[in-house]
């Protein structure tokens, strides 16, 4: 029988009756177009909907849309569209909701074609007022609020100009002109590639790269001859063109851009590209693509100096640049993340890394099922997840892969189990473990979504006929109990609930299609009455991430520490609730040479856990850039992996000497930097 | 070979403490949660609560809860149990077991080894 | 807590008899159950983990089934040494055990 299907799967006792008295239905008085949604603040129940329908007249398209708001999580909606004054309102820039609990939200008016600039609609009560504010500029860009403070915001003009406000989007001023990309980094600080000749296409590569740490009033020139710039974690980089040809190499500053490294990376030619995959404060992921039309590239892992990098991961998967690569974090666990390889046969292997890029290895075959045709040996396969790159070649792939923070070890994705990624009609496999062992948990492909921190997953078949039935589960995906929510079976668009998986709530999106008409509905379901007590301490269990061989006494040791978690059981069927936190106890343990990456000039052959040096650096002095200076470094080849929190056992030495000399190539030397004020 | 040696019998009064020791040998001491269940004359197994020594961390029944403080002692591979406020139905012969363990679940798998058992009388 | 409920209570039975135990969860608790066996004066032995599983050593006329809240031990064939005393007991949090089978001789 499928999984979760079996007589003994323990049934939630009268939950027809429980969830019949708790699924609220809204029929949208609207023509069917597009619809989208935002959540407006964490925990406040907010979400707006704003669907647009456009008429396609002789000449030109005329445009409607409404605004739609509810305060109960989706049960109840109210029609606002009149407190925008019934504007047409552009869906390309959505709804820029403030971050954190701010409650702002800009919405970007469509205007028309002979005004001086465009128009906004501001909120700061969680859309219950709105006011209008004409532009001076015609945004290019949605509004982006600086993360620190709510009240600033920038944007981008057509005519790249690069345009701040102070309060909130009541007045706006322009800071700079020959603007091609802005962001904002931290303290309020704002960076910005501008160009001198043409425009951000002729003079790329020749980009400057600035810097406003007071919204315009001064400004720095923090690097010239710059392709393109990023941010991650407390890194920034910059791709510089090389002086004599046409590559370019990575640099990067953990000083807002006072100084600057290159980084030991290879460089990329016109057609290649470099990409940050993930960062945090400790460490980066970078992709650097192969030469050629390959569709693959290395991912290479950073020290905590963004500086030195180690090799993580052949073949990887990303055809162009903002291509599709299929590289996800597993956020339900610490050090785990899962993407694509390309193989030398071009099919397409799943990998999965335990130790934030130490290792790869293939995902386990899942013990309940069998190897399709992909697979050589019938007994020997393994799982392959279905991401990005599935659902771009138009697979038959509603989701990418799901995990949460808070709901611990959970990973939901779907997959084929053989030699390779199939292109058959995939199932949905679960994980409780972080992607350490699988389970198919429903046949076929399915929307899923998961609710309380773990205790209830969701899902709704994909199909393409009309669909009244969501199946739920209470038991981390082992048995599913459907429940249909309508008679009248709806077109399925989507799935919504409050991110960050704490809810109770999931709201079903669709229309429904009549003769003359269609209209956009929504079914709201609240799971409150199926887990009708809260969670208490006899409804978790203990549970050591990351767990191999109880009898290695560094059983769980990830980046030199392990956590156990308190995890729900999977036969309490109780709510953790809105307020719930995950629980996790840390135990240091003792350092090995897994806790460290290899410096500077040294590499790991492969299956060995020892640092050798470089063939090429045999016997020259190890002399390097850093900050602008000639760094001499005597090391015996290891340095700490970052994030890394062993203490005790191997302890390799390492010292660095600054040489005082300055290093002549790098193209961001502090010298070439300049300021300026307005 | 795996097992669990544990401190002799015990005679006590009734309001005493009684703490019970339980020597591992032959596997990773660290890696297994070590439970404690008791069995009264003529009568059933009884879970008290179990310990992960890495951690620290102890897990106890709801009816011993505030009687019963479970420990262990990394470097000498033990593990104590200790009951307090005795009264006479708490004569019982008092078992450790290791929690078998497959994979991060400490509890899911049964208790796979046993100590002898301890006898503990409760008596005036 | 999860209530275990073993049935019967004693059974009596002859060497070479199939003889099959039942044990009920009063809510599902999967597959985290195991069985024991005990003989006067001994501790326990495990048989029989996560429902269905032989613990290694353990003769295979033992076998386990059962998921959810309904579970079963079966002995296949019973032989002198299986007289004893056998308990469930559900793994899946705070443990429990049931109340026991005593298997005695017809």
């Known amino acids: 029988s499928a999984p979760g299907e079996d007589e003994e799967c323990g049934r939630v006792r009268d939950f027809v009756a429980k969830l019949a008295n708790n699924t609220h239905q809204h029929v949208f008085d609207d023509l069917r177009g597009s619809v989208s949604l935002s959540w407006v603040g964490d925990s406040t129940g907010v979400i707006l909907v704003l669907t647009t329908f456009h008429v396609p007249l002789v000449i030109m398209t005329f445009g409607q849309s409404k605004l739609y708001r509810s305060e109960d999580y989706g049960k109840n909606f109210k029609d606002i569209t009149d407190l925008i004054n019934n504007t047409f309102i552009r869906t390309e820039f959505g709804m820029a909701i403030g971050p954190e609990n701010s409650g702002k939200v800009v919405l970007t008016a469509e205007v028309s074609g002979g005004s001086r600039g465009g128009r906004i609609f501001r909120s700061s009560d969680f859309a219950k007022n709105f006011v209008q504010t004409d532009l001076p500029f015609h945004p290019l860009t949605q509004m982006m609020y600086s993360p620190q403070n709510s009240d600033y915001l920038l944007a981008l003009s057509t005519e790249n100009g690069l345009w701040v406000s102070k309060n909130f989007g009541g007045k706006w001023e322009e800071i700079h002109k020959a603007v091609c990309l802005a962001k904002w980094g931290s303290d309020n600080t704002i960076f910005f590639t501008t160009y001198a000749n043409g425009s951000c296409k002729a003079d790329l590569g020749a980009l400057e790269l600035w810097r406003t740490s007071d919204l315009g009033k001064s400004f720095k020139t923090i690097g010239v001859k710059i392709y393109s710039f990023g941010l991650g974690g407390r890194f920034l980089f910059a791709s510089v063109m090389a002086d004599k040809d046409t590559t370019r190499r990575i640099h990067v500053s953990t000083d807002q851009g006072d100084t600057w490294s290159m980084a030991q990376l290879p460089s990329v030619g016109q057609e290649q590209f470099y990409s940050i995959l993930a960062a945090n404060d400790d460490m980066v992921f970078m992709h650097v693509d192969e030469p050629g039309d390959t569709g693959f590239g290395t991912i290479f892992t950073s020290d905590d100096r963004g500086i030195v990098y180690s090799k993580s991961l052949d073949r990887h998967l990303y055809t162009t640049t903002g291509g599709e690569t299929d590289f996800t974090n597993v956020t339900s666990l610490r050090g785990v993340y899962i993407t694509s390889v390309l193989s030398e046969d071009n099919s397409i292997q799943t990998m999965i890394t335990f130790d934030q890029g130490g290792r790869w290895t293939h995902l386990r075959k899942p013990e309940n099922s069998e190897c399709d045709a992909t697979a050589k040996n019938k007994n020997e396969c393994s799982l392959h997840i279905h991401a990005s790159y599935s659902i771009s070649q138009k697979l038959n792939v509603p989701m990418a892969p799901l995990s949460e923070p808070n709901a611990v070890g959970i990973v939901i994705a779907h997959g084929s189990v053989g030699d390779a990624i199939s292109v058959m009609v995939p199932d949905v496999y679960i994980s409780d473990d972080g992607g350490y062992s699988w389970t198919k948990m429903l046949e076929g492909p399915h929307y899923y979504t998961i609710l309380d921190s773990g205790g209830i997953i969701v899902a709704i078949e994909h199909s393409s006929r009309p669909i009244n039935v969501i199946k739920f589960s209470t038991d981390e995906g082992q048995c599913w109990q459907t429940y249909t929510f309508t008679r009248d079976p709806i077109y399925f668009t989507g799935l919504a609930s409050e991110p960050g998986a704490r809810s109770m709530n999931i709201s079903i999106w669709g229309f429904t299609e009549s003769f003359l008409t269609s209209q956009w509905v929504s079914y709201t379901i609240d799971f409150k009455d199926i887990l009708e007590r809260n969670c208490e301490e006899k409804d978790y269990t203990i549970w050591l991430a990351h767990s191999t061989d109880p009898e290695d006494y560094e059983d769980g040791c990830i980046l030199g520490y392990k956590e156990q978690f308190l995890r729900l059981r999977k036969s309490s069927v109780c709510q953790n609730g809105r307020d719930y936190v995950v629980t996790k106890q840390p135990s240091i343990c003792l350092c090995s040479l897994e806790d460290f990456l290899c410096d500077f000039g040294y590499y790991r052959p492969e299956n060995d856990s020892k640092c050798v040096e470089q063939p090429e650096l045999k016997g020259h002095d190890l002399e390097f850039c850093l900050y602008g200076r000639e760094e001499h470094l005597t090391t015996n080849g290891y340095r700490k992996i970052p994030g890394d929190k062993c203490q005790g056992g191997v302890n390799p030495v390492r010292e660095v000497k600054d040489l005082k000399k300055k290093c002549t190539s790098n193209f961001l030397s502090p010298e070439k930097q300049n300021s300026k004020s307005n | 070979q795996v097992q669990l040696v544990q401190s002799g019998a015990e005679v006590k009064k009734p309001g005493a403490s009684v703490k019970v020791s339980c020597k591992a040998s032959?596997?990773?001491?660290?890696?297994?949660?070590m439970a404690w269940v008791r069995q009264a004359p003529g009568q059933g197994l009884e879970w008290m609560g179990g310990?992960?020594?890495?951690?620290?961390?102890?897990w106890y029944a709801q009816k011993f809860q505030g009687r019963v403080t479970i420990t262990a002692d990394e470097s000498t591979s033990t593990a104590y149990m200790e009951l307090s406020s005795l009264r006479s139905e708490d004569t019982a012969v008092y078992y450790c077991?290791?929690?078998?363990?497959?994979?991060?679940?400490?509890?899911?798998?049964?208790?796979?080894?046993w100590g002898q058992g301890t006898t503990v009388t409760v008596s005036s | 807590d999860i209530q275990m409920t073993q049935s019967p209570s004693t059974l009596s039975a002859s060497v070479g008899d199939r003889v099959t135990i039942t044990c009920r969860a009063s809510?599902?608790?999967?597959?985290?159950l195991a069985w024991y066996q005990q003989k006067p004066g001994k501790a326990p032995k495990l048989l029989i983990y996560?429902?269905?599983s032989l613990e290694s050593g353990v003769p295979s006329r033992f076998s386990g089934s059962g998921s959810g809240t309904e579970f079963t031990l079966t002995i296949s064939s019973l032989q002198p040494d299986d007289f004893a005393t056998y308990y469930c007991?559900?793994?899946?949090?705070?443990?429990?055990f049931g109340g026991g089978t005593k298997v005695e001789i017809k």
């Open positions: 996560k429902a269905s």
């Open positions: 809510q599902s608790i999967s597959s985290w």
């Open positions: 032959g596997y990773t001491f660290t890696g297994y949660a």
């Open positions: 310990i992960i020594p890495t951690f620290g961390t102890a």
């Open positions: 077991a290791r929690q078998g363990r497959k994979t991060g679940y400490y509890y899911y798998y049964g208790m796979d080894v």
């Open positions: 007991q559900q793994a899946d949090g705070h443990i429990t």
